[in-house]
Amino acid sequence: VSLRIQEDCSHLPRCCPSKQQEFPEEWLKWNPAPVSPPEPLRHTHHPESCRASKDGPLNSRAISPWSYELDRDLNRVPQDLYHARCLCPHCVSLQTGSHMDPMGNSVPLYHNQTVFYRRPCHGEQGAHGRYCLERRLYRVSLACVCVRPRMMA
Amino acid sequence: VSLRIQEDCSHLPRCCPSKQQEFPEEWLKWNPAPVSPPEPLRHTHHPESCRASKDGPLNSRAISPWSYELDRDLNRVPQDLYHARCLCPHCVSLQTGSHMDPMGNSVPLYHNQTVFYRRPCHGEQGAHGRYCLERRLYRVSLACVCVRPRMMA
């Protein structure tokens, strides 16, 4: 399930104060978020219309097909996020791959991802002043899913 | 799109050496990965059988329903990961919500997430010794998607 991609160990010095929110600047270069869409777009095929393909990546073959929209901010960690954008309001027929079935809705699956922004610290200015990381929840759509509509009570 | 969930700022002291791989121990308490599944399980209902509900969370209403399996490792950052486990080999009929349609496959959407493992540093032991973070790619299934089967060439 896992793959080692770096040297075995990175030493952790005990140099920083014990406040839980503190990070060394170097942490920002180690981005634990995706740098490309979850399902790599290995194929030249790309869905930009409401149809389910019989080949290509998973987001093209889904009956709730989606494309990935880039959301980049060089002053955020992670810099690159990808949002799944549903290409159909309803699910596509399994038979034809093109006609929509109004009995199913194609809806985004959302996830609140933690991101960090750099902000000047209160009362500190200039290049040599300390700075802050502002932690925020940022809503990202991971994929589109074909669901049965909610039953109204 | 974003929501502030912490105090405005977390001071970043410039105290740590410049080696890119170094982290303070406190970083481990700041887990930038979800501590709950992407689609919050607000309901007591959760699918453990192959059927698509008309209510409940998205993973229950999907015609490719899935459950979330917790993957916890106290020596990993993030400690908690959730894997989507598909409950059906094929997609469920939109009409009935229970009968499977062999024309569609229910497949997991995978993503290689960067994680860090805590390891004792070479030649150091005990609670006060330094430790290392080993960086790995870890495959996580985010959701299950109903797709048209691949067309065989």
Partner: antibody, heavy 120, light 107 residues
Framework: QVQLVQSGAEVKKPGASVKVSCKAS????????ISWVRQAPGQGLEWLGW????????KYAQKVQDRITMTTDASTTTAYMELRNLRSDDTAVYYC?????????????WGQGTLVTVSS | DIQMTQSPSSLSASVGDRVTITCRAS??????LNWYQQKPGKAPKLLIY???SLQSGVPLRFSGSGSGTDFTLTISSLQPEDFGIYIC?????????FGGGTKVEIK
Amino acid sequence: QVQLVQSGAEVKKPGASVKVSCKASEYTFSNYGISWVRQAPGQGLEWLGWIGAYSGFTKYAQKVQDRITMTTDASTTTAYMELRNLRSDDTAVYYCARVGTGTDSYFDFWGQGTLVTVSS
Amino acid sequence: DIQMTQSPSSLSASVGDRVTITCRASQNINSHLNWYQQKPGKAPKLLIYTASSLQSGVPLRFSGSGSGTDFTLTISSLQPEDFGIYICQQTYITPLTFGGGTKVEIK
């Protein structure tokens, strides 16, 4: 008019380091990023990475990520690119370019280039 | 990494000709494609960004089109100063990558 002025040509030996500077003027430095691109003699363009001038957050190309460091100095509106452990195939013209910090990542103004020659 | 393939690798055309250069990405890049012009010994100059937007100060004879994997740069009426190398660049996924360039010569 926006200007990016780079430091002069450098000749280095294999294993040495080089630090190229890029002085920006006539725009609000912190509102943009700086990207670094190189071009080996007779070859195409190769993206090395970029830095958000306000945050200092970086992204490096995997090929050079263990040897490169990009920094900015807001007080002098200057960006720096340091490449360590130089090899002969690092011989190239190194360009800095201004880049927006958002999704549309185009390089609208470029420095004049700095020739770095690595030779024993 | 995403491969960017340009064609033709070189062309020779007369003043007033309509010139078309194509760029193909190895995978979908939506509209995250830019075009640059580079003259010998000089830095590249931005012509078109996000596939079809004309950079300020660039003559209207330059236009760009396409999305997904196939893109086109068109010079509607070639001028003597348009010689040089034209390069496409994708910015959808890091590392950003460039095409190998198309050399345009004036007949």
